[in-house]
């Protein structure tokens, strides 16, 4: 895959992932009422990072925001923070990657600067994706723990003791936002990796084209029974040359001795 394609695809994948992270963060269905093996209620409860909602049989839905900061569980605060970090890093990553795109020319920005920016945006996307994945996973772990705790309470006799009135505990399971978050985080991460790979293609590299830019003429090749030795530009007498993508020549290239291109 060409550098431009890899970089472009990485950008698009990261962009989709970033949009998904925003969507997941805003969604109300992080946890939804578990309907399996539960008395069927005429109301359906679901919760997000910012508010909880109840949908009645008529379709009427009432949502209430968490208007407290101190009263919320530390885990929920941590998940919020991780998702926001993911979004912030994603925004910065997108802004940086726009300028880093090979297909966009901005002033006299050379490829080494673009390579650095591509790497930076790639790293930002990777961290953004990881942040979202960790956030969603922490929330999922919290749900699993609470689910089994409430299940234990249900079946340990706490519900109905000796003919007393039963209280049904609402159990919550994974909501759609968790799956959106995992996929989005993964896409952002993949996009970031692709950006980093593209950066390698943009980076000026000493050994990119030296194997095909020979400086030895036919006279310098000595055939011996034990094999042959050709001076191919890797000898100690050869000065380091910088050869950029596209085969642009340096001043040293102009001083090659016998002929311009004298291949073995």
């Amino acid at each position: 895959m060409s550098v431009t394609a890899c970089q472009g695809l990485g950008f698009v994948v990261s962009l989709i992932g970033f949009a998904g992270i925003i969507a997941a963060t805003c969604m109300d269905q992080w946890s939804t009422q578990d309907l399996y093996n539960n008395p069927v209620t005429a109301v359906f409860n679901y919760q997000g990072l910012w508010r909880s909602c109840v949908r009645e049989s008529s379709g009427f839905t009432e949502c209430r925001g968490y208007f407290t900061l101190l009263g919320l569980p530390a885990m929920l605060q941590a998940v919020r923070a991780l998702m926001i970090v993911g979004i912030v890093l994603g925004v910065i990553g997108i802004l940086v990657s726009i300028f880093a795109l090979k297909c966009i020319r901005i002033g006299s920005m050379d490829d080494s600067a673009k390579a650095k920016m591509t790497l930076t945006s790639g790293i930002l996307f990777i961290i953004s994706g990881i942040s979202a994945i960790i956030g969603v996973s922490v929330f999922a772990n919290m749900l699993v723990t609470n689910f089994w705790m409430s299940t234990a309470n249900m079946y340990s006799g706490m519900g109905g003791m000796g003919g007393m009135v039963q209280t049904v505990q609402t159990r919550y399971t994974f909501g759609a936002a968790l799956f959106v978050g995992w996929v989005a985080g993964g896409l952002t991460l993949i996009g970031g990796v692709m950006m980093c790979i593209a950066c390698r293609g943009l980076t000026p590299d000493d050994s990119n084209f030296k194997a095909v830019s020979y400086h030895a003429s036919g006279q310098n090749v000595a055939y011996r029974p034990g094999g042959f030795k050709a001076s191919t530009g890797f000898g100690s007498n050869t000065r380091n040359k910088k050869i950029y993508d596209g085969g642009a020549r340096t001043e040293d290239d102009e001083q090659s001795h016998p002929t311009k291109y004298d291949y073995v």
């Epitope: 109301v43 009645e56 009135v165 039963q166």
Partner: antibody
């Protein structure tokens, strides 16, 4: 004004079927669920189930599964309930009631359809 | 199914008196998601269909006289008529609106002397 007009009384033989109607007016028919409730003579109320006229979704009280079938005709804003394999136990007044928007309520009721099962 | 138990089954009062009737459910009707109790009260006058009075245990339906008030939470609920009028002669039903199937209490018959 919300109005639910139910069909007239029915006198049927045991084992037969009956289909009653409930014509809604004064509101958008597809915006509210239509519930059906049974009231045996001098007894309390029993919820049979409801139908969502918008998507045809139905929820029955398990006790009435196989006994009652709920349908709607959106174009005429009419809900129907068919009762089959009738016995004397099915003799009652059957009400259609609109599901309220808030609180899982039944906010408007039809006048009722009396069903008498007798040989 | 959820069992709704109403008491007393009937009561006779004179106009102007205060009346309270009770309704108990076999399971809590309180939804933790919105802290609302899904209990509804209906009034059925002789020869008429039931009429919605109160939902969410304590919210009065529009057009219902303010002498009717609902209270309670979880499993124990009460309907209070602050000053009974002659037109309040009816059977009052409580309904579980939380669990399927929705279930009704046996009713409390209010008679006026």
């Amino acid at each position: 004004e919300v109005r639910l007009q139910q069909s007239g009384p029915e006198l049927v033989k045991p084992g037969a079927s009956v289909k009653m109607s409930c014509k809604a007016s004064g509101y958008t028919f597809t915006d509210y669920n239509m519930h059906w409730v049974k009231q045996s003579h001098g007894k309390s109320l029993e919820w049979i189930g409801y139908i969502n006229p918008k998507n045809g979704g139905i929820r029955y009280n398990q006790k009435f599964t196989g006994k009652a079938t709920l349908t709607v005709n959106k174009s005429s804003s009419t809900a129907y309930m068919e009762l089959r394999s009738l016995t004397s136990e099915d003799s009652a007044v059957y009400y259609c009631a609109r599901g309220g928007y808030y609180g899982n309520t039944l906010d408007n009721w039809g006048q009722g359809t009396s069903v008498t099962v007798s040989s | 199914d959820i069992v709704m138990t109403q008491s007393p089954s009937s009561l006779t009062l004179t106009a102007g008196e205060k009346v309270t009737m009770s309704c108990k459910s076999s399971q809590s009707l309180l939804n933790s998601g919105n802290q609302k109790n899904y209990l509804t009260w209906y009034q059925q006058k002789p020869g008429q269909p039931p009429k919605l009075l109160i939902y969410w245990a304590s919210t009065s339906e529009s057009g219902v006289p303010d002498r009717f008030t609902g209270s309670g939470s979880g499993t124990d609920f009460t309907l209070t008529i602050s000053s009974v009028q002659a037109e309040d002669l009816a059977i009052y039903y409580c309904q579980n609106a939380y669990f399927y199937p929705w279930t009704f209490g046996g009713g409390t018959k209010l008679e006026i002397k």
